[in-house]
């Protein structure tokens, strides 16, 4: 899916109402705090490329993100804002139920989950410069 | 001054329902996530339930998924604690308290709790 | 689910420093909560997170961590001190559920 069309500022203005508050809960109590930013992305459509392959695809030691509140906040706001989104997601989510399993949470969630928190932030900030 | 106050606690019969209340004040109060924990007689603490900030997500402890029922009314500034199904086991001194959503799990602020007695 | 656990009882002379400690699988990951409850009481947070201490708790008590065990540490124990301490932290085999420790009785001499 292309990002490009998508109304920023309803994104934005999503993630700093509730967004935010659910991935810093998701976090929270966690010693491993200092996890190191792998994952970056250069403007907001890249960003917004980035945030939805690690909300949504299953990762090695990492497949239940996508039930999580912050990621069914993010789906709701991509799907609002995003023209076209949803259409796009509908083949995803019935292949994605077909491999659901019990959800463990590992330490590679919370890392996953920084880099998210990374990417949200640099999305919000767009004018900065890449590091 | 930041307050909670449950009500709700009686005796029932087992297998009986109740529902029990926590009134919040001083404080913003859908800015928290809420938790219950309970307290048998001479025993220890045990968390029962949380809910978060948003009432989205609820999360219950295995000794009572199934059977009690977590929610609440930002509206109102209050949490409650629907109980199904009730055990002898399940007696015991409810407290609810309040959990800032950066700090989920640790809970900043108790109420003096709700005593359930469940008893023929 | 995990399981916390804490020395049933422990005893310091007044004045003197005593480590109260929590053990489980989940503190390799997560920071343990610390809660104080006297008789006939609400518990108290007195520390969250890394080692922080809710305003009115005196500094005479500390967090710290290593491994999958945590520390209450309280320097100069008083007899207002003598109580139940309880630790707790998010549970590793689901995070988001909640983990209390059994307890430890502190009773200072």
């Known amino acids: 899916y292309d990002f490009t069309n998508c109304d920023f500022e309803k994104i934005k203005a999503a993630y700093l109402s509730t967004i935010s508050k659910d991935l810093i809960t998701y976090m929270s109590g966690t010693k491993s705090t200092e996890f190191n930013n792998t994952v970056s992305c250069s403007n907001r459509p890249h960003c917004l490329t980035e945030i939805q392959s690690l909300t949504f695809n299953p990762t090695a030691g990492c497949a239940s993100l996508a039930k999580e509140m912050f990621a069914m906040k993010t789906k709701a706001a991509l799907a609002i804002w995003c023209p076209g989104y949803s259409e796009t997601q509908i083949n995803a989510t019935q292949a994605m139920k077909k491999r659901r399993k019990r959800k463990v949470t590992t330490n590679k969630c919370l890392e996953q989950v920084s880099q998210l928190q990374g990417l949200w932030r640099r999305f919000n900030r767009p004018l900065l410069k890449q590091q | 001054e930041v307050q909670l106050v449950e009500s709700g606690g009686v005796v029932v019969q087992p297998g009986g329902s109740l529902r029990l209340s926590c009134a919040a004040s001083?404080?913003?109060?859908?800015?928290?996530?809420m938790h219950w924990v309970r307290q048998a007689p001479g025993k220890g603490l045990e968390w029962v339930s949380l809910?978060?900030?948003?009432?989205?997500?609820?999360y219950y402890a295995d000794s009572v998924k199934g059977r009690f029922t977590i929610s609440r009314d930002n509206s109102k500034n209050s949490l409650y604690m629907q109980m199904n199904s009730l055990r002898t086991e399940d007696s015991a001194l409810y407290y609810c308290?309040?959990?800032?959503?950066?700090?989920?799990?640790?809970?900043?602020?108790w109420g003096q709790g709700t005593t359930v007695t469940v008893s023929s | 689910s995990s399981e916390l656990t804490q020395d049933p009882a422990v005893s310091v002379a007044l004045g003197q420093t005593v480590r109260i400690t929590c053990q489980g699988d989940?503190?390799?990951?997560?920071?343990a909560s610390w809660y104080q409850q006297k008789p006939g009481q609400a518990p108290i947070l007195v520390i969250s997170?890394?080692?922080n201490r809710p305003s009115g708790i005196p500094d005479r008590f500390s967090g710290s961590s290593s491994g999958n065990t945590a520390s209450l540490t309280i320097t100069g124990a008083q007899a207002e001190d003598e109580a139940d301490y309880y630790c707790?932290?998010?549970?590793?085999?689901?995070?988001?559920?909640?983990?209390f420790g059994g307890g430890t009785k502190l009773t200072v001499l």
């Open positions: 989940s503190l390799r990951t997560y920071y």
């Open positions: 001083g404080f913003t109060f859908d800015d928290f996530t």
């Open positions: 308290a309040r959990g800032p959503y950066y700090y989920f799990y640790g809970m900043d602020v």
């Open positions: 997170d890394k080692n």
């Open positions: 707790n932290s998010r549970d590793s085999s689901d995070n988001h559920l909640v983990v």
């Open positions: 809910i978060s900030w948003d009432g989205g997500s609820t």
